[in-house]
Amino acid sequence: SGTTNTVAAYNLTWKSTNFKTILEWEPKPINQVYTVQISTKSGDWKSKCFYTADTECDLTDEIVKDVKQTYLARVFSYPAGHVESTGSTEEPPYENSPEFTPYLETNLGQPTIQSFEQVGTKVNVTVQDEWTLVRRNDTFLSLRDVFGKDLIYTLYYWKSSSSGKKTAKTNTNEFLIDVDKGENYCFSVQAVIPSRRTANRKSTDSPVECMGHEKGESRETGHHHHHH
C-alpha cells in the first residue's frame, strides 16, 4: 500500500473540557484518510478513528482509563480507498501530538448554580456537580469525585442594587454566606484548581443568578426552589 501523495497531519491539538477529549488536526483531507493512535508512556499504541476523513478524533474513552497518566497521540495519513495490507512494510506519514495529561490539562467547564436558599441573613448557594465520563467500578464520576479537594469554587456575589462584588471560596460544592436582610443578591461561580499554574487554572464564570428569580427564593416568602 503506497503512501505517495499523502501528507502528514500537522497542528495536532488537544481540546478537552471536563475530560471530554478530542484530538484535532489539519489539513482537511484531499484524497487521503487518517488513523489515530494513542498511548501512555508504556508505548502500547491503540488505534482509533480508523481511516477517517474527519480531522478530529474523540479519544475520551482512552484517556478516562487513567486521567493522571500522560498520553501521546499520533495521526497517520493513508491514500483514500486504502485497504490494510499485511505485506506492506512502508510506514505511512504521521505526526505526533503534544503530550497531554488530562488531570492537569483538561479545561474546567462552565459551572452552573444549582440552587440558592435564604434563611434569615444566611444564603446557601449550591454549585451543580458536573458528571464526567471518568469511571470507577462502572460508575461515572463527578468532577468533584475526580478532583477532590484539588477543585475549589469561587463565588462572586453582589447586591442587585450595587456593583461592589464580594467573594467566597469553598472546597465543597456549597457556600454559606452572610447577606443583608431585605436585600436581593446576584451570584456567579467559577471553578478553580489552585495547584495549576497555567491558563486552564480557572473555568469561565457561571451564568449569573439573582435572588427574586426562579432559581431560589427567600424562605420568608414561603417558597424556595431547587433545580436539578
Epitope: 498511548s39 508512556k41 508505548g43 502500547d44 499504541w45 505526533n96
Partner: antibody, heavy 118, light 106 residues
Framework: EVQLLESGGGLVQPGGSLRLSCAAS????????MGWVRQAPGKGLEWVST????????YYADSVKGRFTISRDNSKNTLYLQMNSLRAEDTAVYYC???????????WGKGTTVTVSS | DIQMTQSPSTLSASVGDRVTITCRAS??????LAWYQQKPGKAPKLLIY???SLESGVPSRFSGSGSGTEFTLTISSLQPDDFATYYC????????FGGGTKVEIK
C-alpha cells in the same frame, strides 16, 4: 530512585546464545516501554530493540531481527534480551533503558559487556 | 531508515566557551529529537528531548533548538564537567543515533 541493572553478559563463541536481564526499580515498570541500546568498543550508540509496557508490541533493528528477542516479566520488574546466532559484530556493551512511548531513553543502566569471539 | 549526521565529530573548547553541536536528519523528523551526554566508561544521560525540552535535573546552560532536519545543542558556558561525547537521536521513525561529537579540552 529509578534504577536499572543489567546482567548476563560474558564471552560467547560465534553462533552461540546469551540472555541478558535488566532488573528495574523505583518506578512502575509496566507503565513504561523499555529498550536495549548497544555500543561496540570505540563506536557510537546503536538502538537494538524496544518493547511496550504490556509486552504486546516489539521493535527490532534490522541488524538483529530474527536473531534477538526482547521480552519482559512485569511481575518481576525485569526486561530480557535473548540473543541467538551471535556474531563478532554483536560484541558491545549492552544498555537497558527506560523509554517513554518507546521514543527516547530517559534512564539508562550501567551496561553489561557481551564479547563474541572464538 | 532515517540517517542522523552530527558535526563536528570532534570539538576542542575551553571552559567558559559557548559550544554548538549540529545534528542533521536525512528527512524531516519534526521536533522528535533527543540529545544525550556520555562520559568514558559510563552510560549515556538524557539532556534534551522533543528538540528543546530540558530533562529534569539538567543544568540550564544546555539548550536545544531546531525542527525539521536541522538541530543544534548549545552549551552556553562550557564547564569542566561538560567534556564528554554528545549524541543526537531521532524518534520519528524507529530510533537512530547520530555518530557522536566529542567535546575535548583545547
Amino acid at each position: 530512585e529509578v534504577q536499572l541493572l543489567e546482567s548476563g553478559g560474558g564471552l560467547v563463541q560465534p553462533g552461540g546464545s546469551l540472555r541478558l536481564s535488566c532488573a528495574a526499580s523505583g518506578f512502575t515498570f509496566s507503565d513504561y516501554a523499555m529498550g536495549w541500546v548497544r555500543q561496540a568498543p570505540g563506536k557510537g550508540l546503536e538502538w537494538v530493540s524496544t518493547i511496550s509496557g504490556s509486552g504486546g508490541l516489539t521493535y527490532y533493528a534490522d541488524s538483529v531481527k530474527g536473531r534477538f528477542t526482547i521480552s519482559r516479566d512485569n511481575s518481576k520488574n525485569t526486561l530480557y534480551l535473548q540473543m541467538n546466532s551471535l556474531r563478532a559484530e554483536d560484541t558491545a556493551v549492552y544498555y537497558c533503558a527506560k523509554a517513554p512511548y518507546g521514543y527516547y531513553m530517559d534512564v539508562w543502566g550501567k551496561g553489561t559487556t557481551v564479547t563474541v569471539s572464538s | 531508515d532515517i540517517q542522523m549526521t552530527q558535526s563536528p565529530s570532534t570539538l576542542s573548547a575551553s571552559v567558559g566557551d559557548r559550544v554548538t553541536i549540529t545534528c542533521r536528519a536525512s528527512q524531516s523528523i519534526s521536533s522528535w529529537l533527543a540529545w544525550y551526554q556520555q562520559k568514558p566508561g559510563k552510560a549515556p544521560k538524557l539532556l534534551i528531548y522533543k528538540a528543546s525540552s530540558l530533562e529534569s535535573g539538567v543544568p540550564s546552560r544546555f539548550s536545544g533548538s531546531g525542527s525539521g532536519t536541522e538541530f543544534t545543542l548549545t552549551i552556553s558556558s562550557l564547564q569542566p564537567d561538560d567534556f564528554a561525547t554528545y549524541y543526537c537521536q531521532q524518534y520519528k521513525s524507529y530510533i537512530t543515533f547520530g555518530g557522536g561529537t566529542k567535546v575535548e579540552i583545547k
